[in-house]
Interface confidence: medium
């Protein structure tokens, strides 16, 4: 009796399953009871000797490439051996590497978690993923794993993490880079500082008073609101960050508390109040303001 080993598929791709079948075409199955065993190179596979003429291999990898055969024996210990069959496992090169972010869009709040997810549309076997910061490419981390995606995590994002990032994937056919992804770190506004600027030390009625409000930290654009005794005077924007000013032509009614508020969509902050009082210097003919 002759024995044949059949592999299906005969040219598997990495990661795909293969079924090995040990066939005896010239022997009726009722003639004798057989035990089967499958081998690669010099090693027995799976459960060793078994009553099943089939062996299912869930996933084949590049290192599973080799010479396979099977053996069959009757209960009387007669052993039949198949010829060797070469099974070559085909590796798919990595292709279409992409870098995505969590949160999506690459905008992240300072202090929040940022995950850079490197993915390949195709590619099999052990894939080495590498993450780089900046267009010139400061290597941040590398991971080798048998999956189409890998993650690099920045647990608490800082302002200095605002940069372009890219990743590279490689599985033996040369490195394949992703496109650049820009990370924007959004910073809530700090408590603004309100400064009152007058054309002279003792500001007088009809002078123009400049209210300058500035949050020293915060992602632009920043919207500033100006208040006198909790009444809205108006708003000004700082499209590129920094401060903003509001001008006021002084009258006697402008004595009192002034404050300002900054908001960039990540939360509002109110300044401390600044008090402006009228004083009448001795011998003076007109009212003056002091803060």
């Amino acid at each position: 009796a002759e024995l044949f080993l059949i592999a299906s598929p005969s040219h598997p791709t990495e990661g795909s399953p293969v079924t090995l079948t040990c066939k005896m075409p010239f022997l009726q199955s009722s003639d004798a009871q057989f035990q089967f065993c499958f081998f690669r190179d010099t090693r027995a596979l799976g459960p060793g000797w078994s009553s099943s003429p089939k062996l299912q291999i869930a996933a084949m990898w590049k290192e599973d490439t080799g010479s396979y055969w099977c053996e069959a024996q009757t209960m009387a210990s007669k052993v039949l051996r198949s010829r060797r069959s070469q099974i070559n496992v085909h590796r798919v090169p990595v292709a279409d590497v992409s870098l995505e972010t969590q949160p999506p869009g690459g905008q992240v709040m300072e202090g929040d978690r940022l995950v850079l997810i490197c993915s390949v549309a195709m590619g099999t076997g052990d894939i080495t993923f590498l993450w780089y910061k900046g267009a010139v490419g400061l290597n941040l981390q590398s991971k080798t794993q048998r999956s189409l995606t890998a993650e690099y995590e920045i647990p608490s994002v800082r302002e200095s993490d605002a940069e372009q990032y890219y990743c590279v994937a490689e599985n033996g056919y040369g490195p394949s880079p992703s496109g650049l992804v820009s990370i924007t770190v959004r910073i809530p506004v700090s408590r603004p500082i309100l400064m009152l600027r007058a054309p002279r030390a003792q500001a007088a009625v009809e002078d123009v008073l400049e209210l300058h409000c500035e949050a020293l930290r915060g992602s632009p654009p920043i919207l500033y609101w100006f208040y006198h005794e909790d009444i809205t005077l108006g708003s000004r924007s700082a499209p590129s960050g920094g401060g903003a000013s509001f001008n006021l032509s002084l009258t006697e009614e402008h004595s009192g508390n002034y404050s300002c508020e900054a908001n960039n969509g990540l939360g509002a902050q109110r300044s401390e109040a600044v008090t402006l009082n009228f004083t009448v210097p001795t011998g003076a003919r007109s009212n003056h303001l002091t803060s």
């Epitope: 919207l223 708003s235 499209p239 969509g265 990540l266 509002a268």
Partner: antibody, heavy 117, light 108 residues
Framework: QVQLVESGGGVVQPGRSLRLSCAAS????????MHWVRQAPGKGLEWVAV????????YYADSVKGRFTISRDNSKNTLYLQMNSLRAEDTAVYYC??????????WGQGTMVTVSS | EIVLTQSPATLSLSPGERATLSCRAS??????LAWYQQKPGQAPRLLIY???NRATGIPARFSGSGSGTDFTLTISSLEPEDFALYYC??????????FGQGTKLEIK
């Protein structure tokens, strides 16, 4: 008298466009941010878009991003909402509202937009 | 996105009674919360800003309280004209400027 008056609503087929206007009077229009807010029949209020007082910054709700454009003409004291690729779910009363920094203090009477084939 | 949840959805009371409406935020909005009243066929009307400040011309029977995530609108003694829809809105984090789903105050 501080007032906002919307116009431009009507019945339009899905996929078509419409432009809403909001005429402001009684206050210095160029000092205030302006919003569009909508209310579908029998539903709650949904913020749509904002434009800052100087027109330099615009933000949109995710549901309209890429389809709607907010703009303003400070010389004409008018706010606009250009609505493209309209869908049935855009059917609503559209209000313009003034941003007072701490609330929307002045609202228009609203204009009805019906998207139907 | 900050989610505002109003409760109850409907409140049935009689004129003269006290009404308490609640608004809860999914994360802190500091005191940047406004309340609006809306009557059928009309635009919303600002009642309260900064969680507790009455807008110009709003009667003293309307009051707001709370900060952070929990806010309350109280109408001390209901007048017939107070039966309407009430919405809360946060202005701390944007976009979007989110509204609650509304509370309907109806006559019992």
């Amino acid at each position: 008298q501080v007032q906002l008056v919307e116009s431009g609503g009507g019945v339009v087929q899905p996929g078509r466009s419409l432009r809403l206007s909001c005429a402001a009077s009684g206050f210095t229009f160029s000092d205030y941010g302006m919003h569009w807010v909508r209310q579908a029949p029998g539903k709650g209020l949904e913020w749509v878009a904002v434009i800052w007082y100087d027109g330099n910054n615009k933000y949109y709700a995710d549901s309209v991003k890429g389809r709607f454009t907010i703009s303003r003409d400070n010389s004409k004291n008018t706010l606009y909402l250009q609505m493209n690729s309209l869908r049935a779910e855009d059917t609503a009363v559209y209000y313009c509202a003034r941003d007072w920094g701490r609330a929307f203090d002045i609202w228009g009477q609203g204009t009805m937009v019906t998207v139907s084939s | 996105e900050i989610v505002l949840t109003q409760s109850p959805a409907t409140l049935s009371l009689s004129p003269g009674e006290r009404a308490t409406l609640s608004c809860r935020a999914s994360q802190s909005v500091s005191s940047y919360l406004a309340w609006y009243q809306q009557k059928p066929g009309q635009a919303p009307r600002l009642l309260i800003y900064d969680a507790s400040n009455r807008a110009t011309g709003i009667p003293a029977r309307f009051s707001g309280s709370g900060s952070g995530t929990d806010f309350t609108l109280t109408i001390s003694s209901l007048e017939p004209e107070d039966f309407a829809l009430y919405y809360c809105q946060q202005l701390n984090n944007w976009p979007p400027y989110t509204f609650g789903q509304g509370t309907k105050l109806e006559i019992k």
